[in-house]
Amino acid sequence: MMTGTIETTGNISAEKGGSIILQCHLSSTTAQVTQVNWEQQDQLLAICNADLGWHISPSFKDRVAPGPGLGLTLQSLTVNDTGEYFCIYHTYPDGTYTGRIFLEVLESSVAEHGARFQIP
């Protein structure tokens, strides 16, 4: 039975050209986390494998940094980065848990005056 829950940063906004941390946290389960996938729509951004560490997809190598922890840092943000991001926790024996984050990348002036979910 899957008892765990994923907590995420929810809906966040960030400034164009800046960076943002995507964070998820799995709680309420003793299941072993074997791998965490970070995906944008159907595109794989990065994977943190418990045995082998971080693998960053080649196409995102220059704009994605691992961490902190099992989180992911997106850098040099563009308006095209706006959208849904998913953290997918592969666990044993529970199975797969998925968390969702919506990121809105705003033009500089808009982000400065209207960002409601800005993460420093």
Partner: antibody, heavy 128, light 107 residues
Framework: EVQLVESGGGLVQPGGSLRLSCAAS????????MDWVRQAPGKGLEWVGR??????????EYAASVKGRFTISRDDSKNSLYLQMNSLKTEDTAVYYC???????????????????WGQGTTVTVSS | EIVLTQSPGTLSLSPGERATLSCRAS???????LAWYQQKPGQAPRLLIY???SRATGIPDRFSGSGSGTDFTLTISRLEPEDFAVYYC????????FGGGTKVEIK
């Protein structure tokens, strides 16, 4: 051409130290994990340890038999891998190979790891 | 630590024959973490198979790998003179470990 060339082997007394080098060329060194593997005379292959890549903060892992005595490091600016061997024992006598670790994902949930490029090896003899 | 046991230790066969090499793990191994290497005297190992069944670049199709869980097999469908060598299986771990090797020698 993708190539690894080891150097630094030689004869050393028990308790002594030696530093092996591995020069890499023909690929983006900083992207790759790098492993050291050794082979004692007439024996099989034994993994010594590994350094991960830049994305993984160059973290290192070691076999139990060398932990605390051997240190793996790298210099991406020189495309070079190193193995510092201290407190050497006679059982460390072997040919030492450096190898490129290939860590990638064929799909979102299948991580592959293997050593696809090997150096020619350098011989370390520990004897009094 | 996962122990890989290879059998037989030595396989005596003639060119043209089929070779079947076994690698058994002390506990379950992800198939994508299992690789096979060939080593000839005085040479470095060479990658043959990765992910239990995928041939490395430039490896002839007479080499094939199969298996999952704790039992893996390397098959050489028709032995060529250059195939007589020692073969090692390897898993990622941690820690990474090799099997003890199987020597394929000319009968």
């Amino acid at each position: 051409e993708v190539q690894l060339v080891e150097s630094g082997g030689g004869l050393v007394q028990p308790g002594g130290s030696l530093r092996l080098s591995c020069a890499a060329s023909g690929f983006t060194f900083s992207d790759h994990y790098m492993d050291w593997v050794r082979q004692a005379p007439g024996k099989g292959l034994e993994w010594v340890g590994r350094t991960r890549n830049k994305a993984n903060s160059y973290t290192t892992e070691y076999a139990a038999s060398v932990k605390g005595r051997f240190t793996i490091s790298r210099d991406d600016s020189k495309n070079s891998l190193y193995l510092q061997m201290n407190s050497l024992k006679t059982e460390d006598t072997a040919v030492y190979y450096c190898a490129r670790g290939q860590y990638y994902y064929g799909s979102s949930s299948r991580g592959y790891y293997y050593m696809d490029v090997w150096g020619q090896g350098t011989t370390v003899t520990v004897s009094s | 630590e996962i122990v890989l046991t290879q059998s037989p230790g030595t396989l005596s066969l003639s060119p043209g024959e089929r070779a079947t090499l076994s690698c058994r793990a002390s506990q379950s191994v992800r198939s994508s973490y299992l690789a096979w290497y060939q080593q000839k005297p005085g040479q470095a190992p060479r990658l043959l198979i990765y992910g239990a069944s995928s041939r490395a670049t430039g490896i002839p199709d007479r080499f094939s790998g199969s298996g999952s869980g704790t039992d893996f097999t390397l098959t050489i469908s028709r032995l060529e003179p250059e195939d007589f060598a020692v073969y090692y299986c390897q898993q990622v771990g941690p820690p990474l470990t090799f099997g003890g090797g199987t020597k394929v020698e000319i009968k």
